[in-house]
């Protein structure tokens, strides 16, 4: 029985050229997190593995930094970075939990953070 929930930064926006932190948090479960994958639509951005550390996909090495914690920092944002991002928590014994974040990269300075929300 999967009892955990993932809290994410929800819908967020940021300015072109700036940076943003994508953050997820798994709660309400005692399951052991073995790996967290960060994906943008169907592209793997980074992996944080409990036994190995961080692996950043080669095509994102210049613009992606690990952390804080199990989060991910995206730098030098472009309009093309607009879209859905997923944190995928692989846990034992529960299985997989997925959180969704929507990022909008804006040309102007009207970037504003959305509210946090939970995905069961």
């Amino acid at each position: 029985m999967m009892t955990g929930t993932i809290e994410t930064t929800g819908n967020i926006s940021a300015e072109k050229g700036g940076s943003i932190i994508l953050q997820c948090h798994l709660s309400s479960t005692t399951a052991q997190v073995t790996q967290v994958n960060w994906e943008q639509q169907d592209q793997l951005l980074a992996i944080c593995n409990a036994d190995l550390g961080w692996h950043i996909s080669p095509s994102f090495k210049d613009r992606v930094a690990p952390g804080p914690g199990l989060g991910l920092t995206l730098q030098s944002l472009t309009v093309n970075d607009t879209g859905e991002y997923f944190c995928i928590y692989h846990t034992y014994p529960d299985g997989t939990y997925t959180g969704r974040i929507f990022l909008e990269v804006l040309e102007s300075s009207v970037a504003e953070h959305g509210a946090r929300f939970q995905i069961p």
């Epitope: 593995n49 409990a50 036994d51 190995l52 550390g53 961080w54 692996h55 950043i56 690990p66």
Partner: antibody
Framework: QVQLVESGGGVVQPGRSLRLSCAAS????????MHWVRQAPGKGLEWVAV????????YYADSVEGRFTISRDNSKNTLYLQMNSLRAEDTALYYC????????????WGQGTMVTVSS | DIQLTQSPSSVSASVGDRVTITCRAS??????LAWYQQKPGKAPKLLIY???SLQSGVPSRFSGSGSGTDFTLTISSLQPEDFATYYC?????????FGGGTKVEIK
């Protein structure tokens, strides 16, 4: 007791291939990540590759990516390193090693097997 | 990749001396640093993991400290069996990387 024993090293010409083996005993091999680390004569340690417990999660050092392949046979408690397109700079003592789970330190090492790439 | 710079590359010391070896990472690696001891013709031996946790069976005269980019291995009172080469290793990022080593020699 926990033991790792490497084999398969030898002298090989540049461009040729070699497969190293590492026989494990004394622990639950099928539950452990496994690593290869090498040491050129008179030089320091260089991490080479790692493989997940179930054979997934394979990662390599940039210096061997695309030439070396790490694999394992959990039914035989054996780790492998297939080395293709060997170069003189691959000459080294190759160690297999077991990590402390979730601590990211290598606590059990084999005695090493020597690979010499020379024409 | 993360570069680890160890200093000094070699140190001459006497039995009973306090010896300190430093390891500096090119980027922050939190506390994901291990220390190893290697004697000639032997495989490395894990001393410290997680920057400061002593591996089981390792004498308490060995200690590790630091986080972020700067780390230290200290041998509080050097013993004859401690003359060896010491390596740091980071495990925050793949690929894992090792420092160049510090040789502790008899003065």
């Amino acid at each position: 007791q926990v033991q790792l024993v490497e084999s398969g090293g030898g002298v090989v010409q540049p461009g040729r291939s070699l497969r190293l083996s590492c026989a494990a005993s004394g622990f639950t091999f099928s539950s452990s990540y496994m690593h290869w680390v090498r040491q050129a004569p008179g030089k320091g340690l260089e991490w080479v590759a790692v493989i997940g417990a179930d054979g997934s999660n394979k990662y390599y050092a940039d210096s061997v990516e695309g030439r070396f392949t790490i694999s394992r046979d959990n039914s035989k408690n054996t780790l492998y390193l297939q080395m293709n397109s060997l170069r003189a700079e691959d000459t080294a003592l190759y160690y297999c090693a077991k990590p402390v789970p979730r601590r990211r330190g290598l606590d059990v090492w084999g005695q090493g097997t020597m690979v010499t790439v020379s024409s | 990749d993360i570069q680890l710079t160890q200093s000094p590359s070699s140190v001459s010391a006497s039995v009973g001396d306090r010896v300190t070896i430093t390891c500096r990472a090119s980027q922050g690696i939190s506390s994901w640093l291990a220390w190893y001891q290697q004697k000639p013709g032997k495989a490395p031996k894990l001393l410290i993991y997680g920057a400061s946790s002593l591996q089981s069976g390792v004498p308490s005269r060995f200690s590790g400290s630091g986080s972020g980019t700067d780390f230290t291995l200290t041998i509080s009172s050097l013993q004859p069996e401690d003359f060896a080469t010491y390596y740091c290793q980071q495990a925050f990022y793949l690929p894992w990387t090792f420092g160049g080593g510090t040789k502790v020699e008899i003065k």
